[in-house]
């Protein structure tokens, strides 16, 4: 924390400039009066500041600002975002998409993943819900960044918003976002032919049930065994050898590249030996011939 | 430009561990998996394992198994490869390769990290 | 684990003239699952030829390969100066994956 002392009369700061830059830690605490700041950062982001001066410029905000900075001046915080921790961003009321934009630039090559996390879904929060506009500036300016939004966030998202989402954008989704996004992109997508269909509809397949999987290996799609692999295990778990091959086409032979892999591993062993030798991968580890499957859990559930 | 840019050459002590970052650029991270392949000098091409970004899964050559970690950090489109207990034979070229999942060839390969143990 | 062997060890030619690069395996690949690189010294291998056969993004059609089961073979119809460098075969057809000791081939 820096000292509180007194600012010598020669030092009085009467307006944002670049002569601050020669001041000592000390000095821009004592003279730098925090409403001035506050009134002109629009300057502070062309003044070539150390990260220790920056210190006490964030520090002076802060007690001006114990609830959080205004909209005002959180638009010009430039590289005093760096600054900020989660925490402080916590307290912020954002609604403007150029905020949003100005703030994203600056934390473009920092390890600022957290920050930006918190910094989106206050946009969020503060617009009230995950529009067209917002969907477009965070695909534009950070690819990616969707995804770090909470399945509760995700739900906000009209399903007319979806076609705005590109599969670079899910890339970073977990499985508990796919299954947000998953039934509002089928939602938008519905009216689609087959082929234009799977194509829009396959970066949302993480979040598909095992049914809608089963309806697509009725629709010769070649699934790529990158999408196979993506899809929830649960969902892949129940689909016959006949369905994935029907599912993947050409593309089936992947199966044995993979075949280490969840959750194709998985599907093996479920699967009788005799039903996978008829794809002639030599896909190893499923369920012997002559061999009966008892589900347990069945008979538990009927006790 | 589909590109896998790798961290810098390491020295190490034997015992010790390294890890080597592949940060990949140009694709969709998670259509294909990360194979790391090392390369002892003058010697041939040696297959460590794989990770798929998509679900962090792994496999790795049992020659290595215990030893190497292969983890991905999606937010960065970045894939690590961490080998411990580190021997004078681990001496070699570390390579990421990007193979697309579903098949078994490597189309783009990073520039390689030179990892050197010696005493 | 699946062995490749590769002959010859070293194949000394001259520009213009034809190569032959043999890879034989220790039991019998699936086809789809072999491929050929091309390594020069100081740099990253780079993918020639996939799936025994098909050639890769960019490599001249003077690069071939052929084969099944156990033996494989690249062929470079007509040897150009960019072209004397270290090939290795490579099998991805059962765990773990496994490399050719390499062919080198140098200007005679």
């Known amino acids: 924390d820096v000292e509180r002392t007194t600012c010598p009369p020669e030092k009085e700061v009467h307006e944002i400039d670049e002569s601050l830059i020669f001041y000592k830690k000390r000095e821009l605490e004592a003279c730098v009066d925090a409403a001035l700041l506050a009134a002109q950062m629009d300057r502070v982001d062309a003044i070539p500041f150390t990260y220790e001066q920056l210190d006490v410029l964030k520090h002076k905000l802060d007690e001006l600002y114990p609830q959080g900075y205004p909209e005002s001046v959180i638009r010009h915080l430039g590289h005093l975002f760096l600054k900020m921790s989660p925490e402080d961003i916590r307290k912020w009321n954002v609604t403007s998409l150029e905020t949003l934009k100005a703030l994203l630039k600056v934390s473009k090559g920092h390890e600022m993943s957290a920050q930006v996390a918190t910094l989106i879904d206050r946009v969020v929060v503060g617009r009230g819900q995950l529009d067209k506009d917002t969907v477009d500036t965070l695909t534009a300016f950070c690819p990616g960044c969707l995804c770090s939004l909470s399945p509760e966030r995700l739900s906000s998202v009209p399903p007319s918003v979806i076609g705005a989402v590109r599969p670079q954008d899910l890339d970073t989704c977990g499985p508990r976002q796919l299954d947000v996004l998953y039934p509002k992109a089928r939602l938008a997508f519905q009216n689609m032919s087959g082929s234009e269909y799977f194509v829009k509809i396959r970066p949302f397949l993480g979040g598909a049930p095992t049914e809608d999987v089963k309806a697509l290996s009725q629709q010769n799609v070649s699934m790529d065994l990158a999408t196979f692999m993506k899809l929830r295990r649960e969902a892949v778990l129940p689909l016959t050898v006949a369905e994935v091959q029907k599912l993947l086409g050409p593309h089936v032979e992947g199966l044995k590249v993979e075949e280490q892999h969840s959750p194709v591993r998985d599907w093996i062993l479920k699967q009788r030996q005799d039903d996978l030798d008829t794809l002639g991968l030599g896909l190893q580890g499923g369920i012997p011939n002559g061999y009966l499957i008892l589900d347990l859990s069945v008979r538990e559930a009927l006790s | 430009e589909v590109q896998l840019v790798q961290s810098g050459a390491e020295v190490k002590k034997p015992g010790a561990s390294v890890k080597v970052s592949c940060k990949a650029s140009g694709y969709t991270f998670t259509d294909y998996n990360m194979d790391w392949v090392r390369q002892a000098p003058g010697q041939g091409l040696e297959w460590m394992g794989d990770i798929n970004p998509s679900t962090g899964g792994t496999i790795y050559n049992q020659k290595f198994n215990g030893r190497v970690t292969m983890t991905e950090d999606k937010s960065t489109s970045t894939v690590y490869m961490e080998l411990s207990s580190l021997r004078s034979e681990d001496t070699a070229v570390y390579y990421c390769?990007?193979?697309?999942?579903?098949?078994?060839?490597?189309?783009?390969w990073g520039q390689g990290t030179t990892v050197t143990v010696s005493s | 684990e699946i062995v490749l062997t590769q002959s010859p060890a070293t194949l000394s030619l001259s520009p213009g003239e034809r190569a032959t690069l043999s890879c034989s395996a220790s039991?019998?690949?699936?086809?789809?699952?072999l491929s050929w690189y091309q390594q020069k010294p100081g740099s990253s291998p780079r993918l020639l030829i996939y799936r025994t056969s098909n050639l890769a993004s960019g490599i001249p059609a003077r690069f071939s390969g052929s084969g099944s089961g156990t033996d494989y073979t690249l062929t470079i119809s007509s040897l150009e100066p960019e072209d004397f460098a270290v090939y290795y075969c490579h099998q991805w057809s059962s765990f773990p994956y496994t490399f050719g000791g390499g062919t080198k081939v140098e200007i005679k």
């Open positions: 390769a990007r193979r697309r999942i579903g098949t078994g060839y490597f189309d783009v």
């Open positions: 039991s019998s690949v699936i086809s789809s699952y």
